[in-house]
């Protein structure tokens, strides 16, 4: 779940379609699975399989469901309260530096190194030097590693390249 959404990511709702349930906002906010009406008086349900909202919100539109790319498998479908969950196909992984695409895992380790970690949807194979046990310098850190280290690790302002 990450940033920079564009206008097409906001899924326009049909005007008061019969199947869209309405309820009243609570403290100006609508519950997950809903968005707020333009006049702020109603909460309108998202459309199953088309759009969603995950938290209490004052969104004018629900967010459009992600469609898994080729090279990805759908782990769970989009519901009104949760976006589609996509995962790289077997033999490929999504690295932190290019999260928009799945990349092929390496088939083996360089000479003088031994494999200590398998290819997963989140990481390439992990290689270490036979003697020193240190990781290969070209190793891409697994996404899981960045998640577990995220709490307070930024001791200095982090930067966004671009």
């Amino acid at each position: 779940e990450s940033a920079l959404i564009t206008q097409q990511d906001l899924a326009p709702q049909q005007r008061a379609a019969p199947q869209q349930k309405r309820s009243s906002p609570s403290e100006g906010l609508c519950p997950p699975g809903h968005h707020i009406s333009e006049d702020g008086r109603d909460c309108i349900s998202c459309k199953y399989g088309q759009d969603y909202s995950t938290h209490w919100n004052d969104l004018l539109f629900c967010l459009r469901c992600t469609r898994c790319d080729s090279g990805e498998v759908e782990l769970s479908p989009c519901t009104t309260t949760r976006n589609t969950v996509c995962q790289c196909e077997e033999g490929t992984f999504r690295e932190e530096d290019s999260p928009e695409m799945c990349r092929k895992c390496r088939t083996g380790c360089p000479r003088g190194m031994v494999k200590v970690g398998d290819c997963t949807p989140w990481s390439d194979i992990e290689c270490v030097h036979k003697e020193s046990g240190t990781k290969h310098s070209g190793e891409v850190p697994a996404v899981e590693e960045t998640v577990t280290s995220s709490p307070g690790t930024p001791a200095s302002p982090c930067s966004l390249s671009g």
């Epitope: 940033a3 920079l4 906001l10 968005h35 707020i36 004018l60 999260p99 966004l160 671009g162």
Partner: nanobody
């Protein structure tokens, strides 16, 4: 290159208010969804609120609904979090976050690749 710097934290009594700011430098934030997370002492990261791109609306965690308000001033390249009716359980380091993937608002640590330094909020009498 964008750098994020939070400010506005401090010591406040229960029931009091604070306004946190997150100043971004190096690039406009107007086209980015941005979020606030917090980490209480000895606990994991918790999503607080997210500001969706282009004033499309905002997300709030159940725990802060009706008490906190997220906003932004694109002309000042700054994200805000107005915190009212503060409680002891709101004590935490508050982080401003942004990610680079063109998808949806950041509501989990997995999607938050870029963090500010954090600002400490202590609610105590």
């Amino acid at each position: 290159e964008v750098q994020l710097l939070e400010s506005g934290g401090g010591l406040v009594q229960p029931g009091g208010s604070l306004r946190l700011s997150c100043a971004a430098s190096g690039r406009s934030i107007s086209n980015y969804a941005m979020s606030w997370f917090r980490q209480a002492p000895g606990k994991g990261l918790e999503f607080v609120s997210a500001s969706v791109w282009n004033n499309g609306g905002n997300y709030y965690a159940d725990s802060v609904k009706g008490r906190f308000t997220i906003s932004r001033d694109n002309s000042k390249n700054t994200l805000y979090l107005q915190m009212n009716s503060l409680r002891a359980e709101d004590t935490a380091v508050y982080y401003c976050v942004v990610a680079r993937t063109p998808e949806t608002p950041i509501t989990s640590a997995r999607g938050a690749n870029y963090w500010g330094q954090g600002t400490l909020v202590t609610v105590s009498s």
